[in-house]
Interface confidence: medium
Amino acid sequence: MMTGTIETTGNISAEKGGSIILQCHLSSTTAQVTQVNWEQQDQLLAICNADLGWHISPSFKDRVAPGPGLGLTLQSLTVNDTGEYFCIYHTYPDGTYTGRIFLEVLESSVAEHGARFQIP
C-alpha cells in the first residue's frame, strides 16, 4: 500500500536569465528511494540513483546542476523553460510517486515564488 505523499515547490516563477531550484520531498513512508527522475514533459533532465549517483542529460549539462538534496537547479533560464516539470520517485517496496511543478519564466523583474502545496 502506498502511504507516502510528495510535497513540491508547486507553481513557481523566475526571471529570465536567473536560476531556480526545483524541489520535491517524499514523506509519510518508510520506503527506500532507489532513484529520482527529473523530467520536463517527455524529456529526461536528470536522474539521481541511490547507488550510481547523479547523471545529467548531455543537452542540459550546461544549465542544470544537481541538488540541493534530491532537487534540481536550473540556471540561465529562458522563456522556453516555462512548463511542467516532474519529479518521479522510484521506491521499494511502495512503487512510484510523482510530483508536478509548473515553472513560468518571466521577462520582468516581478517574479514571485508560488506557495508550496501537496500532491496526494
Partner: nanobody, 120 residues
C-alpha cells in the same frame, strides 16, 4: 568487492545491432541498480540506461539519445545485465561500461568497459 566484466562489444555497421553483457561476481548482496554508461573519445562518461528496483518489480530509465533503440534488462539469477542496442549510429561509438550498486549504499562498482565501434 564486486567484479564486473563487460562483453559483446565490437565493430558494427550503421543500422546494425549488438548485445552487451555485464557479468557480476564476488560479494553480491541485494542489488538495487545496474546501469550502462559510455565514454566516447575526448568526451565525458555519460549515462545510457539503468534498471532500478521499484515496487514489486523494476523500472528502466534511458538517456533520450538511445530511447527506443536500446533496451536494458537483468537476469538476477545470473547476476548479469544486458544492453540490447539496435539501429546503431556512428555517434554511438564509445567504450561502454556497466555499473552496479555495491554492498555499501551510495557507492558503486564499475567494469573495465567494452568498445563499440559503429562504422562502415
Amino acid at each position: 568487492e564486486v567484479q564486473l566484466v563487460e562483453s559483446g562489444g565490437g565493430l558494427v555497421q550503421p543500422g546494425g545491432s549488438l548485445r552487451l553483457s555485464c557479468a557480476a561476481s564476488g560479494r553480491i548482496f541485494r542489488r538495487n541498480s545496474m546501469g550502462w554508461f559510455r565514454q566516447a573519445p575526448g568526451k565525458e562518461r555519460e549515462f545510457v540506461a539503468v534498471i532500478t528496483r521499484s515496487g514489486g518489480g523494476e523500472v528502466t530509465t534511458y538517456a533520450d539519445s538511445v530511447k527506443g533503440r536500446f533496451t536494458i534488462n537483468a537476469d538476477n539469477s545470473k547476476n548479469t545485465a544486458y544492453l540490447q542496442m539496435n539501429s546503431l549510429k556512428p555517434e554511438d561509438t564509445a567504450v561502454y561500461y556497466c555499473a552496479m550498486s555495491s554492498v555499501t549504499r551510495g557507492s558503486s562498482d564499475w567494469g573495465q568497459g567494452t568498445l563499440v565501434t559503429v562504422s562502415t
